[in-house]
């Protein structure tokens, strides 16, 4: 089931999903001067089953001026520099779908893709937040938001993260300022929580993210 809205915005922070739940849509958006081909898909879809998931449909962009550039190839390195990256600058790679059943990895770029990726997330999706470079996190460990279904409505939990403008090299400093207790996930809330497997795997993954630094992110 699709989440009704987008994940919360945190000032000076970016978010990413480590893997995308089945049913997630990624809009086929093109950079300026290009547009989706007339016979092209509106979006890519994470589809499959518990043992194997993959992105269905292919995004293709064509020049707005001359409508014949419909090939789909991976951008060259210089083309990739123009795009906002979804990869974190750390040795950690996106989770393989095999290690997280029912999920897809970050899809590869397509030629002349827009700089911003527009996802439509589904219930149970977890996204992780981190302060952008030059900002300091007033929180130890990963901050996350989960799309939950409660009383027939979807909502995202509030990420436990505040980013301040102090120039620090460490994203998660040893000393942190106290902050008000953010929204938690009460045990009694059972309608459409993330499955235990999802939560355990993703929490373990998140623990490895402490030292990693996001660059400019898709939001």
């Amino acid at each position: 089931e699709l989440c009704d809205d987008d994940p919360p915005e945190i000032p000076h922070a970016t978010f990413k999903a480590m893997a995308y739940k089945e049913g997630t849509m990624l809009n086929c958006e093109c950079k300026r001067g290009f547009r989706r081909i007339k016979s092209g898909s509106l979006y890519m879809l994470c589809t499959g089953n518990s043992s194997h998931s993959s992105w269905d449909n292919q995004c293709q962009c064509t020049s707005s001026a001359t409508r014949n550039t419909t090939k789909q190839v991976t951008p060259q390195p210089e083309e990739q520099k123009e795009r906002k990256t979804t990869e974190m600058q750390s040795p950690m790679q996106p989770v393989d779908q095999a290690s997280l059943p029912g999920h897809c990895r970050e899809p590869p770029p397509w030629e002349n893709e827009a700089t911003e990726r527009i996802y439509h997330f589904v219930v149970g999706q977890m996204v992780y937040y981190q302060c952008v470079q030059g900002y300091r996190a007033l929180h130890r460990g990963p901050a996350e938001s989960v799309c939950k279904m409660t009383h027939g409505k979807t909502r995202w939990t509030q990420p436990q993260l505040i980013c301040t403008g102090e120039m620090e090299t460490s994203q998660f400093p040893g000393e942190e300022k106290p902050q008000a207790s953010p929204e938690g996930r009460p045990e009694s809330e059972t309608s459409c929580l993330v499955t235990t497997t999802d939560f355990q795997i993703q929490t373990e993954m998140a623990a490895t993210m402490e030292t990693s630094i996001f660059t400019t992110e898709y939001q």
Partner: antibody
């Protein structure tokens, strides 16, 4: 919560034009295409076209080229559709849609009559 | 243009029944099909995207299936509030097109 609020009903003369609006709330307006749909009794639903407010791109159904003009104002998060040279065939309910057709406005009824 | 045909304009059903609404495309659309429900005097409401995925808040008695050119919306355990008109739509290629609609009514 995502909402698409459309302007009120219009009674217009043949040969004139009409411009209706669709104000989006609850999501990032510049991220998603806004589509426009025509509905007439006995004629079902017809896709008119769509506009991407972020890049100001438009796509039109050939049938509505020259009839409909789609625009968007990112400052007010509002999409507009203007219909020109109106005839009785244009009498219909017009819907705007957002976020890949997941959300629909309440519709604007256009009645063309002399 | 890709023509979507909903061969049955009307379907009669009873509360508790299982009913299947069909939609046939003139050209292959993969799974790029959506289903909408429209009640009199209301806007269409999105039920299904990508042929088989439910939108949030849509009861699980609504299920979509199919790929290529043949698609089905199945309503199991029909409720009185399900009496409405159902439309399919393809968004695989421009211009996007809709089926003519199938009206579900009580026997």
């Amino acid at each position: 919560q995502v909402q698409l609020q459309q302007s009120g009903a219009e009674l217009v003369r043949p040969g004139t034009s009409v411009k209706m609006s669709c104000k989006a709330a609850g999501y990032t307006f510049t991220n998603y295409w806004i589509g426009w749909i025509k509905q007439r009794p006995g004629h079902g639903l017809e896709w008119i076209g769509d506009i991407h407010p972020g890049g100001d791109y438009t796509n039109y159904n050939e049938k509505f080229k020259g009839k409909a003009t789609l625009t968007a104002d990112t400052f007010s998060s509002t999409a507009y559709m203007q219909l020109s040279s109106l005839t009785s065939e244009d009498s219909a309910i017009y819907y705007c849609t957002g976020r890949n057709f997941a959300y629909w406005g309440q519709g604007t009824l256009v009645t063309v009559s002399s | 243009d890709n023509v979507l045909t909903q061969s049955q304009k009307f379907m009669s059903t009873s509360v508790g029944d299982r009913v299947s609404v069909t939609c046939k495309a003139s050209q292959n659309v993969g799974t790029n099909v959506a289903w909408y429900q429209q009640k009199p005097g209301q806007s269409p409401k999105a039920l299904i995207y990508s042929a088989s995925y439910r939108y949030s808040g849509v009861p699980d008695r609504f299920t979509g299936s199919g790929s290529g050119t043949d698609f089905t919306l199945t309503i199991s355990n029909v409720q009185s509030e399900d009496l409405a008109e159902y439309f399919c739509q393809q968004y695989n290629s421009y211009p996007y097109t809709f089926g003519g609609g199938t009206k579900l009514e009580m026997k």
